[in-house]
């Protein structure tokens, strides 16, 4: 129980098209240290939709205040949802390394389903 | 052993809130879903809504939203959902249960024993 | 929402004899990572909700053999293979794919 768990409890999230889609994350703890960044989709072509550490993503807010001492939650919100947004979001626990950092551990991913917006 | 205890039985009137308790022990309080549903008399199982108390925010059955409230105090591990704006049709039993973290972060996989509240003029 | 239909609405039991309850979901269940997002309850009279079958087929800590949970997508269905007196209650399907959590209307399973 004490090892860190990436918590994604959402295995589904419907938004229409326009809207914001918010995909949720936590961390069971604090260690080991290092960021957090989501992708879409898995393996070698995954696409980087946040960065925690670096990066300008103006599309992506992060729902609680990342820099807040002891912050677990570690939740996006998307604006503008298009269907070109669809698909599986993972996000993923970083271990600091030296010179970069080590994939520690991911969620077990969030698939984002688009509506037609109502008309 | 994971145990859920839930606060004693309310009757209450028409108009009125009541706040049922479920105080949780064994596990990792904070990484858990503690969801709520109710059963009204005879009648099937209804999912109110949830909360995992590491995010602090609740979801809600849209039917329930505006009118029920689930929080959590990770201090004493315990969870509240309060219902408002009683009326007779809320007369039920209301259970919590609590779901594994990860993969299956909203299986209820230990209730409460349940708390019958009674809305009755 | 996503609904979920159980049937049948009632279900009279021979002891001995299997017995089977058929879940439909309005949409698939089954996510990218290969799980089907669909439990299983018994309440037995008097009692709490517990948890059968979970993520589909999966039985619950010391949940008997007899019992067994199979389907994929939209349809699903909970095996008794020899049903045994203490296994009268309401069985009832839920999905956890997508909040809100959604059960099925339950089945009322007897002894003749």
């Known amino acids: 129980e004490d090892e860190l768990q990436v918590i994604q409890p959402e295995k589904s999230v419907s938004v229409a098209a326009g809207e914001s889609a918010t995909l949720r994350c936590a961390m069971t703890s604090l260690i080991p240290v290092g960021p957090i960044m989501w992708f879409r989709g898995a393996g070698a072509g995954r696409e980087l939709i946040y960065n925690q550490k670096e990066g300008h993503f103006p599309r992506v807010t992060t729902v609680s205040e990342l820099t807040k001492r002891n912050n677990l939650d570690f939740s996006i919100s998307i604006s503008n949802i298009t269907p070109a947004d669809a698909g599986t979001y993972y996000c993923v626990k970083f271990r600091k390394g030296s010179p970069d950092d080590v994939e520690f551990k991911s969620g077990a991913g969030t698939e984002l389903s688009v509506r037609a917006k109502p008309s | 052993q994971v145990q859920l205890v839930q606060s004693g039985a309310e009757v209450k009137k028409p108009g009125s809130s009541v706040k049922v308790s479920c105080k949780a022990s064994?596990?990792?309080?904070?990484?858990?879903?503690i969801s709520w549903v109710r059963q009204a008399p005879g009648q099937g199982l209804e999912w109110m809504g949830g909360?995992?108390?590491?995010?602090?925010?609740?979801n809600y059955a849209q039917k329930f939203q505006g009118r029920v409230t689930i929080t959590a105090d990770e201090s004493t591990s315990t969870a509240y959902m309060e219902l408002s704006s009683l009326r007779s049709e809320d007369t039920a039993v209301y259970y919590c249960a609590r779901g594994r973290p990860q993969s299956e972060s909203y299986l209820l996989d230990y209730w409460g024993q349940g708390t019958l509240v009674t809305v009755s003029s | 929402d996503i609904v979920m239909t159980q049937s049948p609405l009632s279900l009279p039991v021979t002891p001995g004899e299997p017995a089977s309850i058929s879940c439909r979901s309005s949409?698939?269940?089954?996510?990218?990572?290969?799980?089907?997002?669909l439990d299983w309850y018994l309440q037995k009279p008097g009692q709490s909700p517990q948890l059968l079958i979970y993520?589909?087929?999966n039985r619950a800590s010391g949940v008997p053999d007899r019992f067994s949970g199979s389907g994929s997508g939209t349809d699903f269905t909970l095996k008794i293979s020899r049903v045994e007196a203490e296994d009268v209650g309401v069985y009832y399907c839920?999905?956890?794919?997508?909040?809100?959590?959604?059960f099925g209307g339950g089945t009322k399973v007897e002894i003749k």
């Open positions: 949409q698939s269940l089954l996510h990218s990572n290969g799980y089907n997002y």
């Open positions: 909360i995992i108390p590491i995010f602090g925010t609740a």
């Open positions: 993520l589909g087929s």
């Open positions: 839920m999905q956890t794919l997508q909040v809100p959590l959604t």
């Open positions: 064994g596990g990792t309080f904070s990484s858990y879903a």
